[in-house]
Protein backbone atom coordinates (compact mmCIF):
# COMPACT_ATOMS: atom_id res chain seq x y z
CA UNK A 1 0.00 0.00 0.00
CA UNK A 2 0.95 3.50 -0.70
CA UNK A 3 0.77 5.88 1.91
CA UNK A 4 -0.69 9.39 0.21
CA UNK A 5 -0.13 12.94 1.57
CA UNK A 6 -2.29 15.96 1.48
CA UNK A 7 -1.33 19.32 1.03
CA UNK A 8 -2.13 22.12 -0.48
CA UNK A 9 1.54 24.25 0.18
CA UNK A 10 2.03 26.87 -2.73
CA UNK A 11 4.99 27.92 -1.28
CA UNK A 12 8.63 28.08 -3.19
CA UNK A 13 10.34 30.07 -0.59
CA UNK A 14 12.74 28.75 2.30
CA UNK A 15 10.62 27.85 5.53
CA UNK A 16 11.75 25.18 8.10
CA UNK A 17 15.03 25.07 6.77
CA UNK A 18 13.78 23.54 3.58
CA UNK A 19 13.64 24.85 0.10
CA UNK A 20 9.77 24.13 -0.91
CA UNK A 21 8.20 23.63 -4.36
CA UNK A 22 5.10 24.74 -5.70
CA UNK A 23 2.21 21.77 -5.91
CA UNK A 24 0.48 22.28 -9.00
CA UNK A 25 -2.31 20.46 -10.27
CA UNK A 26 -0.10 17.45 -12.40
CA UNK A 27 2.88 18.18 -11.63
CA UNK A 28 5.88 19.27 -8.91
CA UNK A 29 7.00 22.08 -9.91
CA UNK A 30 11.26 22.38 -9.88
CA UNK A 31 12.06 24.97 -7.06
CA UNK A 32 13.13 27.57 -9.33
CA UNK A 33 11.56 29.54 -11.73
CA UNK A 34 14.53 29.15 -14.15
CA UNK A 35 13.66 25.35 -14.02
CA UNK A 36 11.10 25.28 -17.04
CA UNK A 37 10.86 21.90 -17.47
CA UNK A 38 8.54 20.31 -14.37
CA UNK A 39 8.43 16.99 -13.41
CA UNK A 40 5.87 14.70 -13.94
CA UNK A 41 5.12 12.44 -11.19
CA UNK A 42 4.46 9.08 -11.01
CA UNK A 43 1.10 9.30 -8.86
CA UNK A 44 -0.40 12.47 -8.21
CA UNK A 45 -4.09 12.88 -8.24
CA UNK A 46 -5.72 16.10 -7.47
CA UNK A 47 -8.93 15.74 -5.09
CA UNK A 48 -10.92 18.57 -3.90
CA UNK A 49 -8.31 20.98 -4.66
CA UNK A 50 -5.48 19.52 -2.54
CA UNK A 51 -2.63 17.23 -4.15
CA UNK A 52 -2.26 14.16 -3.33
CA UNK A 53 1.10 12.58 -3.43
CA UNK A 54 2.48 9.53 -2.09
CA UNK A 55 5.40 12.49 -0.39
CA UNK A 56 5.02 14.58 2.73
CA UNK A 57 4.20 17.96 2.11
CA UNK A 58 6.65 20.48 0.68
CA UNK A 59 8.76 16.96 -0.94
CA UNK A 60 9.67 17.08 -4.48
CA UNK A 61 8.42 13.93 -6.12
CA UNK A 62 10.58 12.40 -9.48
CA UNK A 63 9.75 9.19 -10.58
CA UNK A 64 9.38 6.33 -7.63
CA UNK A 65 11.15 8.31 -4.65
CA UNK A 66 10.68 11.78 -2.69
CA UNK A 67 13.21 14.74 -2.37
CA UNK A 68 13.65 17.13 0.06
CA UNK A 69 16.38 19.69 -0.16
CA UNK A 70 17.43 20.86 3.48
CA UNK A 71 18.16 24.22 3.67
CA UNK A 72 19.84 23.84 7.36
CA UNK A 73 23.71 23.74 7.42
CA UNK A 74 25.67 20.07 8.97
CA UNK A 75 28.21 17.80 8.50
CA UNK A 76 27.50 14.70 6.60
CA UNK A 77 26.81 12.63 9.58
CA UNK A 78 24.61 15.14 11.46
CA UNK A 79 22.80 15.44 7.31
CA UNK A 80 22.25 11.59 7.98
CA UNK A 81 21.19 11.98 10.92
CA UNK A 82 18.28 14.59 9.93
CA UNK A 83 17.14 12.36 7.22
CA UNK A 84 16.46 9.22 9.08
CA UNK A 85 14.56 12.28 11.50
CA UNK A 86 12.74 12.25 8.53
CA UNK A 87 12.03 8.50 7.91
CA UNK A 88 14.87 8.72 4.78
CA UNK A 89 18.36 8.49 3.62
CA UNK A 90 20.82 11.12 2.15
CA UNK A 91 20.48 10.95 -1.68
CA UNK A 92 21.42 7.58 -3.56
CA UNK A 93 22.13 8.27 -7.09
CA UNK A 94 20.72 5.01 -9.08
CA UNK A 95 20.09 5.97 -12.71
CA UNK A 96 21.59 8.85 -15.23
CA UNK A 97 18.05 9.97 -15.09
CA UNK A 98 17.56 10.67 -11.85
CA UNK A 99 21.19 12.17 -11.46
CA UNK A 100 19.90 14.77 -14.14
CA UNK A 101 16.75 16.06 -12.38
CA UNK A 102 19.11 16.21 -9.35
CA UNK A 103 21.38 18.58 -11.17
CA UNK A 104 18.54 20.52 -12.58
CA UNK A 105 17.61 21.12 -9.18
CA UNK A 106 21.08 22.08 -7.60
CA UNK A 107 22.25 24.34 -10.31
CA UNK A 108 19.45 26.90 -9.23
CA UNK A 109 21.39 27.11 -6.47
CA UNK A 110 24.74 27.93 -8.05
CA UNK A 111 26.00 29.23 -3.95
CA UNK A 112 24.73 25.77 -2.22
CA UNK A 113 26.51 22.23 -2.02
CA UNK A 114 24.48 19.62 -0.82
CA UNK A 115 25.58 16.19 0.95
CA UNK A 116 24.57 12.92 -1.03
CA UNK A 117 24.92 9.24 0.96
CA UNK A 118 28.00 8.19 -0.25
CA UNK A 119 31.08 8.08 1.78
CA UNK A 120 33.93 6.26 3.00
CA UNK A 121 36.19 5.54 6.04
CA UNK A 122 39.58 6.47 4.22
CA UNK A 123 41.02 6.72 0.41
CA UNK A 124 42.02 2.90 0.84
CA UNK A 125 38.18 1.81 0.94
CA UNK A 126 35.72 2.38 -1.81
CA UNK A 127 33.52 4.49 -1.76
CA UNK A 128 29.97 3.04 -0.19
CA UNK A 129 26.55 4.50 -0.57
CA UNK A 130 24.84 5.02 2.67
CA UNK A 131 23.01 1.24 2.47
CA UNK A 132 25.76 -0.54 2.05
CA UNK A 133 25.63 -0.55 -1.75
CA UNK A 134 28.37 -0.45 -3.70
CA UNK A 135 29.35 3.04 -5.74
CA UNK A 136 30.08 2.65 -9.95
CA UNK A 137 32.01 4.79 -11.59
CA UNK A 138 29.86 4.48 -14.31
CA UNK A 139 27.10 6.94 -13.43
CA UNK A 140 29.77 9.65 -12.44
CA UNK A 141 33.16 10.60 -11.76
CA UNK A 142 33.91 11.96 -8.40
CA UNK A 143 35.57 15.03 -8.34
CA UNK A 144 38.57 15.07 -5.94
CA UNK A 145 39.57 18.09 -3.81
CA UNK A 146 41.98 16.36 -1.57
CA UNK A 147 45.41 18.69 -0.66
CA UNK A 148 48.47 18.16 1.09
CA UNK A 149 46.80 20.05 4.04
CA UNK A 150 43.12 18.12 3.62
CA UNK A 151 44.33 14.89 2.43
CA UNK A 152 40.89 12.87 3.49
CA UNK A 153 37.95 14.33 2.21
CA UNK A 154 35.98 11.04 2.65
CA UNK A 155 32.21 12.10 2.25
CA UNK A 156 30.37 13.29 -1.38
CA UNK A 157 28.43 16.52 -2.58
CA UNK A 158 27.17 17.84 -5.52
CA UNK A 159 27.68 21.19 -6.74
CA UNK A 160 25.76 22.56 -9.79
CA UNK A 161 26.81 19.79 -11.85
CA UNK A 162 29.71 18.34 -10.38
CA UNK A 163 30.02 15.60 -7.63
CA UNK A 164 33.05 16.20 -5.52
CA UNK A 165 34.38 14.81 -2.42
CA UNK A 166 35.17 16.67 0.72
CA UNK A 167 36.07 16.82 4.56
CA UNK A 168 32.95 14.74 6.05
CA UNK A 169 33.10 17.69 8.74
CA UNK A 170 32.06 20.93 6.86
CA UNK A 171 28.75 21.74 6.92
CA UNK A 172 26.91 22.03 4.14
CA UNK A 173 23.42 21.84 2.76
CA UNK A 174 22.11 18.03 1.91
CA UNK A 175 19.44 16.17 -0.29
CA UNK A 176 17.33 13.63 1.08
CA UNK A 177 15.58 10.37 -0.36
CA UNK A 178 12.63 8.65 0.44
CA UNK A 179 11.83 5.80 -1.78
CA UNK A 180 8.52 4.71 -2.10
CA UNK A 181 6.22 1.13 -3.02
CA UNK A 182 3.52 1.64 -5.39
CA UNK B 1 12.98 -10.83 1.71
CA UNK B 2 17.17 -11.52 1.87
CA UNK B 3 18.75 -14.79 1.62
CA UNK B 4 21.76 -16.04 1.48
CA UNK B 5 22.07 -19.88 1.32
CA UNK B 6 25.59 -21.94 1.17
CA UNK B 7 26.39 -25.54 -0.31
CA UNK B 8 26.78 -28.30 2.09
CA UNK B 9 29.51 -29.52 4.62
CA UNK B 10 32.84 -30.51 2.96
CA UNK B 11 35.61 -33.56 4.25
CA UNK B 12 38.76 -32.54 2.94
CA UNK B 13 41.98 -34.19 3.37
CA UNK B 14 45.40 -31.70 3.58
CA UNK B 15 46.73 -30.20 0.73
CA UNK B 16 43.49 -30.39 -1.15
CA UNK B 17 40.67 -27.25 -1.72
CA UNK B 18 37.33 -26.85 -1.37
CA UNK B 19 35.25 -24.20 -3.17
CA UNK B 20 32.09 -23.22 -0.91
CA UNK B 21 28.80 -21.47 -2.86
CA UNK B 22 26.50 -18.94 -1.75
CA UNK B 23 23.28 -18.06 -3.56
CA UNK B 24 22.07 -14.92 -2.95
CA UNK B 25 17.85 -14.09 -3.48
CA UNK B 26 15.43 -11.19 -2.66
CA UNK B 27 17.84 -8.64 -3.79
CA UNK B 28 20.03 -7.23 -6.79
CA UNK B 29 22.77 -9.53 -6.71
CA UNK B 30 25.62 -7.48 -7.88
CA UNK B 31 24.84 -4.01 -5.91
CA UNK B 32 26.62 -5.36 -2.79
CA UNK B 33 29.94 -6.94 -1.97
CA UNK B 34 30.05 -10.07 -0.26
CA UNK B 35 32.21 -11.21 2.53
CA UNK B 36 33.40 -13.99 3.36
CA UNK B 37 34.12 -15.04 7.06
CA UNK B 38 35.09 -18.31 8.83
CA UNK B 39 35.18 -19.25 12.18
CA UNK B 40 37.06 -22.51 13.94
CA UNK B 41 35.44 -24.52 15.70
CA UNK B 42 35.27 -22.37 19.84
CA UNK B 43 36.98 -19.47 18.01
CA UNK B 44 36.07 -16.10 16.98
CA UNK B 45 35.22 -14.85 13.32
CA UNK B 46 37.64 -14.06 11.14
CA UNK B 47 37.57 -11.71 8.23
CA UNK B 48 38.80 -13.16 4.98
CA UNK B 49 38.12 -11.12 2.22
CA UNK B 50 35.41 -10.05 -0.40
CA UNK B 51 33.77 -9.51 -3.57
CA UNK B 52 32.44 -6.97 -5.20
CA UNK B 53 29.58 -8.98 -7.63
CA UNK B 54 29.49 -6.72 -9.93
CA UNK B 55 33.08 -5.67 -11.19
CA UNK B 56 34.63 -9.28 -9.66
CA UNK B 57 37.07 -7.32 -8.09
CA UNK B 58 38.40 -9.24 -4.49
CA UNK B 59 40.34 -7.84 -1.47
CA UNK B 60 41.81 -10.68 0.47
CA UNK B 61 42.80 -10.39 3.67
CA UNK B 62 47.06 -10.62 4.01
CA UNK B 63 46.76 -14.02 5.59
CA UNK B 64 44.81 -16.19 2.92
CA UNK B 65 46.60 -14.13 -0.17
CA UNK B 66 47.89 -16.93 -2.69
CA UNK B 67 45.61 -19.86 -1.52
CA UNK B 68 42.33 -17.64 -1.47
CA UNK B 69 40.00 -17.05 -4.98
CA UNK B 70 36.74 -15.30 -4.52
CA UNK B 71 34.32 -15.72 -7.62
CA UNK B 72 30.87 -14.93 -8.86
CA UNK B 73 28.29 -16.11 -11.33
CA UNK B 74 26.09 -13.06 -11.74
CA UNK B 75 23.56 -15.05 -14.00
CA UNK B 76 22.38 -17.16 -10.92
CA UNK B 77 23.16 -14.80 -8.49
CA UNK B 78 26.28 -17.04 -6.63
CA UNK B 79 29.26 -15.59 -5.11
CA UNK B 80 32.02 -18.75 -4.86
CA UNK B 81 34.91 -19.11 -2.07
CA UNK B 82 38.03 -21.53 -2.72
CA UNK B 83 40.62 -22.23 -0.40
CA UNK B 84 43.26 -23.95 -1.64
CA UNK B 85 46.42 -26.41 0.28
CA UNK B 86 44.28 -26.67 3.11
CA UNK B 87 45.63 -27.88 6.58
CA UNK B 88 43.97 -29.12 9.67
CA UNK B 89 43.85 -25.66 11.01
CA UNK B 90 41.18 -24.36 7.98
CA UNK B 91 38.34 -26.63 9.82
CA UNK B 92 36.17 -24.00 10.29
CA UNK B 93 32.75 -22.69 9.59
CA UNK B 94 32.96 -20.67 6.67
CA UNK B 95 30.22 -18.00 6.27
CA UNK B 96 29.44 -15.39 3.49
CA UNK B 97 27.98 -12.05 4.44
CA UNK B 98 26.13 -9.52 2.37
CA UNK B 99 27.86 -6.00 2.95
CA UNK B 100 25.04 -3.30 4.52
CA UNK B 101 25.41 0.41 5.73
CA UNK B 102 29.02 1.60 6.98
CA UNK B 103 30.63 -1.67 5.50
CA UNK B 104 28.81 -3.88 8.55
CA UNK B 105 27.32 -7.46 7.67
CA UNK B 106 23.43 -7.12 7.57
CA UNK B 107 22.67 -10.59 6.43
CA UNK B 108 24.71 -14.07 6.31
CA UNK B 109 24.31 -17.36 5.02
CA UNK B 110 23.75 -20.47 7.17
CA UNK B 111 27.37 -21.65 7.49
CA UNK B 112 29.40 -24.37 5.50
CA UNK B 113 31.41 -26.53 7.77
CA UNK B 114 34.54 -27.69 6.03
CA UNK B 115 36.32 -30.21 7.88
CA UNK B 116 40.32 -30.76 6.88
CA UNK B 117 41.48 -34.60 8.67
CA UNK B 118 43.92 -37.03 6.77
CA UNK C 1 46.50 -3.89 10.63
CA UNK C 2 44.15 -3.12 13.14
CA UNK C 3 43.69 -5.02 16.63
CA UNK C 4 40.47 -5.29 18.18
CA UNK C 5 39.99 -5.79 21.62
CA UNK C 6 37.32 -6.28 23.89
CA UNK C 7 36.27 -6.28 27.73
CA UNK C 8 35.51 -8.69 29.77
CA UNK C 9 35.85 -11.60 27.63
CA UNK C 10 32.88 -12.89 29.72
CA UNK C 11 30.14 -11.54 31.77
CA UNK C 12 27.34 -13.38 34.07
CA UNK C 13 24.03 -11.74 34.55
CA UNK C 14 20.73 -11.68 35.10
CA UNK C 15 17.51 -10.99 33.44
CA UNK C 16 16.90 -7.00 33.95
CA UNK C 17 20.49 -6.23 34.31
CA UNK C 18 22.23 -3.22 32.23
CA UNK C 19 25.24 -4.34 30.60
CA UNK C 20 27.79 -2.98 29.16
CA UNK C 21 30.02 -4.34 26.85
CA UNK C 22 33.85 -2.36 25.64
CA UNK C 23 35.72 -2.68 22.34
CA UNK C 24 38.94 -0.70 21.78
CA UNK C 25 40.86 -0.33 18.47
CA UNK C 26 44.47 -0.16 18.08
CA UNK C 27 43.87 2.77 16.49
CA UNK C 28 41.35 5.75 15.13
CA UNK C 29 38.56 4.43 13.34
CA UNK C 30 36.41 7.00 13.40
CA UNK C 31 32.61 5.61 13.83
CA UNK C 32 33.14 2.82 11.49
CA UNK C 33 32.14 0.14 13.56
CA UNK C 34 29.80 -2.85 13.85
CA UNK C 35 28.55 -4.81 17.04
CA UNK C 36 27.20 -8.61 16.36
CA UNK C 37 25.39 -11.48 18.26
CA UNK C 38 26.18 -14.78 17.73
CA UNK C 39 24.53 -17.62 19.42
CA UNK C 40 25.71 -21.29 19.63
CA UNK C 41 25.45 -23.01 15.92
CA UNK C 42 23.79 -19.84 14.42
CA UNK C 43 25.31 -17.06 12.10
CA UNK C 44 25.87 -13.69 13.75
CA UNK C 45 23.07 -11.42 13.56
CA UNK C 46 23.95 -7.75 12.66
CA UNK C 47 23.12 -4.97 16.13
CA UNK C 48 25.11 -1.62 15.50
CA UNK C 49 26.15 -0.42 12.12
CA UNK C 50 28.15 3.22 12.38
CA UNK C 51 29.28 2.79 15.91
CA UNK C 52 25.79 4.03 16.76
CA UNK C 53 22.87 3.08 14.83
CA UNK C 54 20.74 0.81 15.37
CA UNK C 55 19.80 -2.07 12.65
CA UNK C 56 16.33 -2.40 11.91
CA UNK C 57 14.32 -5.02 13.89
CA UNK C 58 17.20 -4.96 16.89
CA UNK C 59 15.69 -4.40 20.03
CA UNK C 60 15.99 -0.10 21.30
CA UNK C 61 17.27 -2.31 24.21
CA UNK C 62 20.24 -2.23 22.31
CA UNK C 63 22.81 0.62 21.78
CA UNK C 64 26.24 1.76 20.58
CA UNK C 65 28.45 4.30 21.52
CA UNK C 66 31.78 5.45 20.80
CA UNK C 67 34.43 7.29 17.93
CA UNK C 68 37.91 6.75 17.24
CA UNK C 69 39.31 4.08 19.25
CA UNK C 70 37.14 3.38 21.81
CA UNK C 71 33.42 1.88 21.72
CA UNK C 72 30.81 0.58 24.35
CA UNK C 73 27.25 -1.63 23.56
CA UNK C 74 25.04 -1.38 26.12
CA UNK C 75 21.72 -3.76 26.51
CA UNK C 76 19.50 -1.74 28.92
CA UNK C 77 17.90 -4.50 30.62
CA UNK C 78 18.55 -8.16 29.53
CA UNK C 79 16.40 -10.56 28.14
CA UNK C 80 16.72 -14.31 28.23
CA UNK C 81 17.34 -14.22 24.64
CA UNK C 82 20.08 -12.06 25.14
CA UNK C 83 22.26 -14.62 26.03
CA UNK C 84 25.17 -14.84 23.73
CA UNK C 85 28.46 -14.09 22.31
CA UNK C 86 28.67 -10.78 20.94
CA UNK C 87 31.56 -9.23 18.67
CA UNK C 88 32.67 -5.67 17.48
CA UNK C 89 34.15 -5.20 14.02
CA UNK C 90 35.71 -2.44 12.35
CA UNK C 91 35.68 -1.43 8.79
CA UNK C 92 37.76 1.15 8.50
CA UNK C 93 40.84 -0.46 7.11
CA UNK C 94 41.98 -3.59 5.11
CA UNK C 95 41.71 -6.56 6.47
CA UNK C 96 38.31 -5.58 8.81
CA UNK C 97 38.66 -7.10 11.43
CA UNK C 98 36.72 -8.81 14.45
CA UNK C 99 37.25 -8.56 18.28
CA UNK C 100 37.50 -11.88 20.13
CA UNK C 101 33.72 -11.75 21.80
CA UNK C 102 32.01 -11.04 24.95
CA UNK C 103 30.56 -14.01 26.49
CA UNK C 104 27.11 -12.97 28.08
CA UNK C 105 26.04 -16.22 29.94
CA UNK C 106 22.95 -16.37 32.63
CA UNK C 107 24.46 -15.81 36.42
Known amino acids: TMAIWRSNSGSNTLENGYFLSRNKENHSQPTQSSLEDSVTPTKAVKTTGVLSSPCPPNWIIYEKSCYLFSMSLNSWDGSKRQCWQLGSNLLKIDSSNELGFIVKQVSSQPDNSFWIGLSRPQTEVPWLWEDGSTFSSNLFQIRTTATQENPSPNCVWIHVSVIYDQLCSVPSYSICEKKFSM | QVQLVQSGAEVKKPGASVKVSCKSSGYTFTDYYIHWVRQAPGQGLEWMGW????????NYAQKFQGRITMTRDTSISTAYLELSRLRSDDTAVFYCARNSGSYSFGYWGQGTLVTVSS | DIQMTQSPSSVSASVGDRVTITCRASQGISSWLAWYQQKPGKAPKLLIF???SLQSGVPSRFSGSGSGTDFTLTVSSLQPEDFATYYCQQAYSFPFAFGPGTKVDIE
Open chain 2, 51 to 58: INPNSGDT
Open chain 3, 50 to 52: GAS
